[in-house]
């Protein structure tokens, strides 16, 4: 960067090279060029010469003043007009940055996705800081009091093998940058309480033409957790409101859930599960579409959920998409 150039003098920033966005700042340039009493000192920002707010302080030094500086990054350098020199002589350069101190990290959440081998911790970092901000996740065993620190720029995956201080931990997040430091509240966790079962997946749907036609949704999970509670939500694609069905599930076999739906309507289904009585849910599964027949029985398989417009099937299904108004992973 600009900071690596050979200098014939000195450039500095007040109050600092990294400062709070919106501040008034002064950039000083002091020439130390052999056999040169500068006629004029010039400042450049991102290669463009500045014309205003420049004050000559003495024979070798000048000041450039900025009011309400709002640029996240800028490269500054200054030059001197020396007598008998045709071109301006470079004095020195500096990269400057403006931004904000971090907000207090909140909504700290740690979960273990079954089979992942990791504890994943996330948090809400708050407003954009514009400058390099480090997050240190502190994980402190309540049994051994040993503490580990994980440096990251966003979320963190912590190998469960490294959590050797028992089952109970305190977790907190420190956010720090050149302008400040904040710490989250401490989250107390028990490793057995934060496991999210292996993803539940809807595999197929069929509508049986009985006296009252019924649709059967087939779904499954590879979880080894015995007591699992699940929710399936469904709605006509033209609707905004979801209907939700709850299930206590044993995944030793493929689940079959029955729905009595309106004929000739395209529906969308999603499922999510949690270990019974625990805090965190899986994110909702991918959208699964099924169009109920007018009268004829019909099967929709997961294999046909993607771009089957020209397949000759009676059902035209689209790939998983964004029709849901709430497709976030609900783990809070």
């Amino acid at each position: 960067g600009i900071t690596n150039i050979n200098c014939s003098g000195h450039i500095w920033v007040e109050p600092a090279t990294i400062f709070k966005m919106g501040m008034n700042i002064s950039i000083y340039c002091q020439a130390a060029i052999k056999n040169c009493q500068p006629r004029k000192l010039h400042f450049y920002k991102n290669g463009i010469k500045e014309r205003f707010q420049i004050t000559r302080i003495n024979k070798t030094t000048a000041r450039l003043w900025y009011k309400n500086f709002l640029e996240p990054h800028a490269s500054m350098y200054c030059t001197a007009e020396c007598p008998k020199h045709f071109q301006e002589t470079l004095i020195c350069g500096k990269d400057i940055s403006s931004g904000y101190p971090p907000d207090i990290p909140d909504e700290v959440t740690c979960v273990i996705y079954e089979y992942s081998g990791n504890m994943t911790c996330t948090w809400n970092a708050g407003k954009l800081t514009y400058i390099d901000t480090k997050y240190v996740v502190h994980v402190k065993s309540l049994e051994t009091e040993e503490e580990q620190q994980y440096l990251t720029s966003s979320y963190i995956n912590i190998s469960t093998d490294s959590l050797q201080g028992g089952k109970k931990y305190l977790v907190w997040v420190q956010a720090a940058n050149a302008l400040g430091m904040e710490e989250s509240k401490q989250l107390q966790i028990h490793l057995d309480d934060i496991v999210i079962p292996s993803a539940a997946v809807i595999s197929r749907a069929e509508t049986i033409n009985a006296t009252v036609p019924k649709t059967i949704i087939y779904w499954d999970s590879q979880t080894t957790i015995e007591k699992v509670s699940c929710e399936m939500r469904y709605k006509a694609t033209t609707n905004q409101t979801w209907n939700v069905k709850e299930f206590d599930t044993n995944f030793t076999y493929v689940q079959q859930s029955e729905f009595y739906l309106e004929p000739n309507i395209k529906y969308v289904f999603q499922v999510r599960c949690q270990e019974t009585g625990k805090r965190y849910w899986q994110p909702w599964s991918s959208l699964f579409f099924h169009k109920t027949p007018e009268t004829v029985p019909q099967v929709t398989s997961k294999a046909f959920q993607h771009d089957t417009w020209n397949s000759g099937l009676t059902v035209a299904s689209i790939s998983t998409g964004h029709l849901t108004s709430d497709n976030r992973g609900d783990i809070g």
Epitope: Q149, L151, A176, A178, M181, Q186
Partner: antibody, heavy 118, light 107 residues
Framework: EVQLQQSGPELVKPGASVKMSCKAS????????MNWMKQSHGKSLEWIGY????????GYNQKFKGKATLTVDKSSTTAYMELRSLTSEDSAVYYC???????????WGQGTTVTVSS | DIVLTQSPATLCVTPGETVSLSCRAS??????LHWFQQKSHRSPRLLIK???DSISGIPSRFTGSGSGTDYTLSINSVKPEDEGIYYC?????????FGGGTKLEIK
């Protein structure tokens, strides 16, 4: 200018306690943890523990649990370390140093020499 | 506790030479490693943070590298004022631990 000014040398008798201070200036006191280190003569450094002036959270090296107690006074931007039941093994130079996740241990005090002798 | 082993214990070099100081951790410390210089009867001074991040005010001849368990501090074109003891510190798992130090002597 950032400064960590530590209290002067201490000559104490075995079994006694000592409380040393580290006066911080030139930065926002609550934006950094205060760490304490021990350096015995001619030896490497040992980390004793940290305290967060923002919320009082502490972390200790188990070796010094029961030996050292860390406190802060936010109003005077001063951190303290008390050492109790002193023996000749506790004779050393003790340093305070500020840190956070962005800066690491970037500034150190000049050290407080503790001599335990009867 | 994580043990940091520094090598060599002592290094004697001529001004202008480039030197490499090693710090090996007993387990992965994920770049949570910092380097310090301590001159005689002085406080330690931070040279490099997080294995390779430079520190404002520290000459650019000091550079750090490494990951996992193996880390190196390099001093390009050593100067007489670089004489002192160099320590590494791991800040990954408490208790934070320092290496035993490498004494750098200038001929």
């Amino acid at each position: 200018e950032v400064q960590l000014q530590q209290s002067g040398p201490e000559l104490v008798k075995p079994g006694a306690s000592v409380k040393m201070s580290c006066k911080a200036s030139g930065y926002t006191f609550t934006d950094y943890y205060m760490n304490w280190m021990k350096q015995s003569h001619g030896k490497s450094l040992e980390w004793i523990g940290y305290i967060s002036p923002k919320n009082g959270r502490t972390g200790y090296n188990q070796k010094f649990k029961g030996k050292a107690t860390l406190t802060v006074d936010k109003s005077s931007t001063t951190a303290y370390m008390e050492l109790r039941s002193l023996t000749s093994e506790d004779s050393a130079v003790y340093y305070c140093a500020k840190s956070n996740g962005y800066y690491a241990l970037d500034y150190w005090g000049q050290g407080t020499t503790v001599t335990v002798s009867s | 506790d994580i043990v940091l082993t520094q090598s060599p214990a002592t290094l004697c070099v001529t001004p202008g030479e480039t030197v490499s100081l090693s710090c090996r951790a007993s387990q992965n410390i994920y770049k949570n490693l910092h380097w310090f210089q301590q001159k005689s009867h002085r406080s330690p001074r931070l040279l490099i943070k997080y294995a390779s991040d430079s520190i404002s005010g520290i000459p650019s001849r000091f550079t750090g590298s490494g990951s996992g368990t193996d880390y190196t501090l390099s001093i390009n074109s050593v100067k007489p004022e670089d004489e002192g003891i160099y320590y590494c510190l791991q800040g990954y798992s408490t208790p934070w631990t320092f290496g035993g130090g490498t004494k750098l002597e200038i001929k």
